[in-house]
Amino acid sequence: SGTTNTVAAYNLTWKSTNFKTILEWEPKPVNQVYTVQISTKSGDWKSKCFYTTDTECDLTDEIVKDVKQTYLARVFSYPAGNVESTGSAGEPLYENSPEFTPYLETNLGQPTIQSFEQVGTKVNVTVEDERTLVRRNNTFLSLRDVFGKDLIYTLYYWKSSSSGKKTAKTNTNEFLIDVDKGENYCFSVQAVIPSRTVNRKSTDSPVECMGQEKGEFREI
């Protein structure tokens, strides 16, 4: 039940892209503050964002310790200026978040086409391997490092003069596609984790077209 002048947080929502993970909730505080705790299913609670008036808390540092674990968070409500005050049961008011498994649920960020190079009737398109905040041996891992072959990229490519999009797929960060000589093509890529049932796809990368400075053309 809690004290009469605090309300429990509600609409606890995980917002996560490429493992950058923020817990959001409502309401905007009026004469109250919040503290967040996070734990794995079997672990101890760790407090974050102490006595904040924000309605979000960045939990990235905690979840990147093991992205395959399932996490639970809870948001405590305290009266402003009297954080020792507790509810009628002797505990501050709190609300639990939904469970969150970063590896299965983090959204895939918008990919970027790093470069493309044409050699005759072949074009090699390279996707930037985006850095995440997941660390191993004190270095930040890339998206490919974390997901390995679970992550594929779909390339959409089309003649500048036409609308139909052909597709190619790769479980590396490179595509090698056949093109018609003398035609300019445009490209867009999408990250996909086919083994997922939700949050399977990223938004599309910005479109890059031949004849612009990202690419290189070599006639063989």
Partner: antibody
Framework: EVQLVESGGGLVQPGGSLRLSCAAS????????IHWVRQAPGKGLEWVGY????????YYADSVKGRFTISADTSKNTAYLQMNSLRAEDTAVYYC?????????????WGQGTLVTVSS | DIQMTQSPSSLSASVGDRVTITCRAS??????VAWYQQKPGKAPKLLIY???FLYSGVPSRFSGSRSGTDFTLTISSLQPEDFATYYC?????????FGQGTKVEIK
């Protein structure tokens, strides 16, 4: 349970139009790619075209290009095949199928099909 | 477009027979070949993906293999419910293309 249900088939005159629907349940179409495949009576399977509902990208078989248009309404979780300037050779059972977009990416679920007959 | 040439177009066999159907791609398609089974009045059903992987729920008497651009579907011991038409499909490039089909009939 994943399900695809086609509807909208029927008898139409040459030169006429028809719109087929493919209603999906058990998954969100914007997370997948949806294909249309047809089968003329007593014949084999012919790919018609695809749509990626997440971005609206499409591609069509040469035999239908300029006459058929695939679209999707993600709020209704439904894909559509708009068929214009229909010809006798478009007579077929039309199937929609789900593509999980994996590297091995075959069509893992198909609808039951809807028959389109083009005849005067 | 990549052509998938399937043979034979039909075959007669008895229950318990070993049946082999082949598909040849007109160019390299890596392992991006699937096999489907279709019964009259029904939609195709996925049997094999990535040339040799058995799809979930498909009996182990079905198998697939690849040698270069040649792909084979084998039914080790034909069962009464296996009498149907079988199609190969490449999904390596757009447009995806199907073989012409092989009808497996009762001898």
């Amino acid at each position: 349970e994943v399900q695809l249900v086609e509807s909208g088939g029927g008898l139409v005159q040459p030169g006429g139009s028809l719109r087929l629907s493919c209603a999906a349940s058990g998954f969100t179409i914007s997370d997948y790619v949806i294909h249309w495949v047809r089968q003329a009576p007593g014949k084999g399977l012919e790919w018609v075209g695809y749509i990626d509902p997440s971005n609206g990208y499409t591609y069509y078989a040469d035999s239908v290009k300029g006459r058929f248009t695939i679209s999707a309404d993600t709020s209704k979780n439904t894909a559509y095949l708009q068929m214009n300037s229909l010809r006798a050779e478009d007579t077929a059972v039309y199937y929609c199928a789900r593509d999980p977009q994996s590297l091995t990416s075959p069509f893992d679920y198909w609808g039951q099909g809807t028959l389109v007959t083009v005849s005067s | 477009d990549i052509q998938m040439t399937q043979s034979p177009s039909s075959l007669s066999a008895s229950v318990g027979d070993r049946v082999t159907i082949t598909c040849r791609a007109s160019q390299d398609v890596n392992t991006a070949v699937a096999w489907y089974q279709q019964k009259p009045g029904k939609a195709p059903k996925l049997l094999i993906y990535s040339a040799s992987f058995l799809y979930s729920g498909v009996p182990s008497r079905f198998s697939g293999s690849r040698s270069g651009t040649d792909f084979t579907l084998t039914i080790s011991s034909l069962q009464p419910e296996d009498f149907a038409t079988y199609y190969c499909q490449q999904h390596y490039t757009t447009p995806p293309t199907f073989g012409q089909g092989t009808k497996v009939e009762i001898k």
